[in-house]
Interface confidence: low
């Protein structure tokens, strides 16, 4: 690289240029602007999440209700920008909006008290209120005949009830990707509700749609949790280490203008802010259609498609090829005599530079792991610029690389070959006993829900070639784990999970995969009710029936944590011959009371419970 | 989780070396610290010597200064202690152990251990 370019990125980065592609002129009414950029329909579906996403116990009809109050508002906007009250920010509109809710004391408690702040710490307060894990039913999917019946009476009811069910249960879910998958929801009813055999058709689209649904919020819900608790500057640099492997051909300037137009893309979906979002993440698309030339070989197709598959498909598209011959790293970033002077002048840009070149260079790595590399390059320069001699400081920093790179391929080796060797569901009872041992205070749902996620990485991930294992793999567990911090986060009982989860966004996985066993849990008091089964488990599917089993087990290594692996497998073995036994039985439940006395007597003398 | 499994403890005249070796496997965090800890018959556990990662520094007790030499072989996940210049003092059993961070303390929070090998030094 010519540092002529490093002092001329400089002055780039101070330019209007970089600010990126979002540059309005001032609008005398924002919420006019923003009914015009995006049309009606995009408007009241994307008023109706963010509603959904704040006050996420409300009724249906009572948030239809706000969003046509608010729709009505804008049109009137639009026909004169002038009007009492247009000029006003959205935040103020949408904020005074939700403060008219009746019962918002009665059903948010504390949350009503937001309604006497003024913006933006109204909006903030708002915020801090969003609940990862609301107390609302599960969705229980009606019959097929039902579902296409309501589909054809009030398609546009049945459309907006899909985006309020999600938004309320996914508070930071995509908007404008939710909007995506409302567009694939109405096709499949669409085209289902008129085939010969509707069930056949539709359930497993609808599968497809809840399983690409939940990976889409947690996915999300990583990113924003980066941009809260770790600030722009950490969301950045995820930013140029993906983005820097998906376009290894674009110039730094070209990926470090993404990255700032896509960290504010992020920062207003995850601020509430869900027009902006949408209108801005509209535009980036554009942008990068415009100028695929100069970004990646690879966005042809995504840019022929229609808006909101263009968006998706821009954000999924494959690795571009990297240039042939890109020369070593060590000459710019080691050998130079200018490495301190270069990353004196402007400390983000250099790293931020060598972020870039590191990851189009390896597609092979996780982003997490990327990160860990720069980490360890910017520890070593701030340690080596203040040394004697610099050079011979810093001569060595690759080398610290070595050992960062080895724990996650011998970590993907081991655990690929357990699940080739376990299957899924015994691969994720594995992980259940692994990560009740390490955190056993964090409540029985979290552990199953995350234990059977991290399980789902084998499937996932372990099928691919080598090249392709790390990042599928790592950064997988890394959406995963920010599931746990966040459902802890909301009533904190470990601070093994606190400290793994606050202390650095990359290490999480290493901090938690570094955890022992906890000794100093007072195993839990022995209950005979919590293994106590009943006949309806005959009934329930297959993965209701697998999550039955492994609660137990994780009641089970509560209860007893020196439990050996032999012995957790002599129960759940019985176990499962238990409900094999039982469920086959004339008088199912009165089989399940007789047996399941006797399972738990030969269970407490196998574990010494 | 991290299994360890030590090796090459024995019966060693004063003066004389002894190399032990330490399997690891399992899972390993990325700032693991592994090292050395012994039990002399008798007495509480002593921190003798410890090999941080990534960087390599070693780290060493008193007692064991320019006689003993960690190292480890990251390929083949395996930790050594080369003890030259034995003393009796030095019997004992010898623990591998991952630790935290703060290896340099004199009694460091070791997360996981070994079985142990035993080493006596005796004419």
């Known amino acids: 690289m010519k540092w002529v370019t490093f002092i001329s990125l400089l002055f780039l980065f101070s330019s209007a240029y970089s600010r990126g592609v979002f540059r309005r002129d001032a609008h005398k009414s924002e919420v006019a602007h923003r009914f015009k950029d995006l049309g009606e329909e995009n408007f009241k579906a994307l008023v109706l999440i963010a509603f959904a996403q704040y006050l996420q116990q409300c009724p249906f009809e009572d948030h239809v209700k706000l969003v046509n109050e608010v729709t009505e508002f804008a049109k009137t906007c639009v026909a004169d920008e002038s009007a009492e009250n247009c000029d006003k920010s959205l935040h103020t509109l949408f904020g005074d909006k939700l403060c008219t809710v009746a019962t918002l004391r009665e059903t948010y408690g504390e949350m009503a008290d937001c309604c006497a702040k003024q913006e933006p710490e109204r909006n903030e307060c708002f915020l801090q209120h969003k609940d990862d894990n609301p107390n609302l039913p599960r969705l229980v999917r009606p019959e097929v005949d039902v579902m296409c019946t309501a589909f054809h009476d009030n398609e546009e009811t049945f459309l907006k009830k899909y985006l309020y069910e999600i938004a309320r249960r996914h508070p930071y879910f995509y908007a404008p990707e939710l909007l995506f998958f409302a567009k694939r929801y109405k096709a499949a009813f669409t085209e289902c509700c008129q085939a010969a055999d509707k069930a056949a058709c539709l359930l497993p689209k609808l599968d497809e749609l809840r399983d690409e649904g939940k990976a889409s919020s947690a996915k999300q819900r990583l990113k924003c949790a980066s941009l809260q608790k770790f600030g722009e500057r950490a969301f950045k640099a995820w930013a140029v280490a993906r983005l820097s492997q998906r376009f290894p051909k674009a110039e730094f300037a070209e990926v470090s203008k993404l990255v700032t137009d896509l960290t504010k893309v992020h920062t207003e979906c995850c601020h509430g802010d869900l027009l902006e979002c949408a209108d801005d993440r509209a535009d980036l698309a554009k942008y990068i259609c415009e100028n695929q030339d100069s970004i990646s070989s690879k966005l042809k197709e995504c840019c022929e498609k229609p808006l909101l598959e263009k968006s998706h498909c821009i954000a999924e598209v494959e690795n571009d090829e990297m240039p042939a011959d890109l020369p070593s790293l060590a000459a710019d970033f080691v050998e130079s005599k200018d490495v301190c002077k270069n990353y004196a002048e402007a400390k983000d840009v250099f790293l931020g530079m060598f972020l870039y070149e590191y990851a189009r260079r390896h597609p092979d790595y996780s982003v997490v792991l990327l990160l860990r590399l720069a980490k360890t390059y910017e520890t070593t320069l701030e340690k080596c610029c203040a040394a004697a001699d610099p050079h011979e400081c810093y001569a060595k920093v690759f080398d610290e690389f070595k050992p960062l790179v080895e724990e996650p391929q011998n970590l993907i080796k081991q655990n690929c070959e357990l699940f080739e060797q376990l299957g899924e569901y015994k691969f994720q009872n594995a992980l259940l006993v692994r990560y009740t041992k390490k955190v056993p205070q964090v409540s029985t749902p979290t552990l199953v829900e995350v234990s059977r996620n991290l399980g789902k990485v084998g499937s996932k991930c372990c099928k691919h070639p080598e090249a392709k294992r790390m990042p599928c793999a790592e950064d997988y567990l890394s959406v995963v784990l920010n599931q746990l911090c966040v459902l802890h986060e909301k009533t904190p009982v470990s601070d093994r999970v606190t400290k793994c989860c606050t202390e650095s966004l990359v290490n999480r996985r290493p901090c938690f995969s570094a955890l022992e066993v906890d000794e100093t849990y007072v195993p839990k008091e022995f209950n005979a009710e919590t293994f106590t089964f009943h006949a309806d488990i005959c009934t329930l599917s297959e993965k209701e029936r697998q999550i039955k089993k492994q609660t137990a087990l994780v009641e089970l290594v509560k209860h007893k944590p020196k439990a050996t692996k032999e012995q957790l497998k002599a129960v759940m073995d019985d176990f499962a011959a238990f409900v094999e036994k039982c469920c086959k039985a004339d008088d199912k439940e009165t089989c399940f009371a007789e047996e399941g006395k006797k399972l738990v007597a030969a269970s407490q003398a196998a574990l010494g419970l | 989780q991290v299994q360890l499994l030590e090796s090459g403890g024995g019966l060693v005249q004063p003066g004389g070396s002894l190399r032990l070796s330490c399997a690891a496997s399992?899972?390993?965090?990325?700032?693991?610290?592994m090292g050395w800890v012994r039990q002399a018959p008798g007495k509480g556990l002593e921190w003798v010597s410890a090999?941080?990662?990534?960087?390599?520094?070693?780290y060493y007790a008193d007692s064991v200064k320019g006689r003993f030499t960690i190292s480890r072989d990251n390929s083949k996940n395996t930790l050594y202690l080369q003890m030259n210049s034995l003393r009796a003092e030095d019997t004992a059993v010898y623990y591998c152990a991952s630790v935290g961070d703060n290896a340099g303390s004199s009694s460091p929070p070791f997360a996981s251990w070994g079985q142990g090998t035993l080493v006596t030094v005796s004419s």
């Open positions: 399992g899972v390993k965090a990325i700032n693991h610290t």
């Open positions: 090999i941080r990662t990534p960087d390599g520094s070693t």
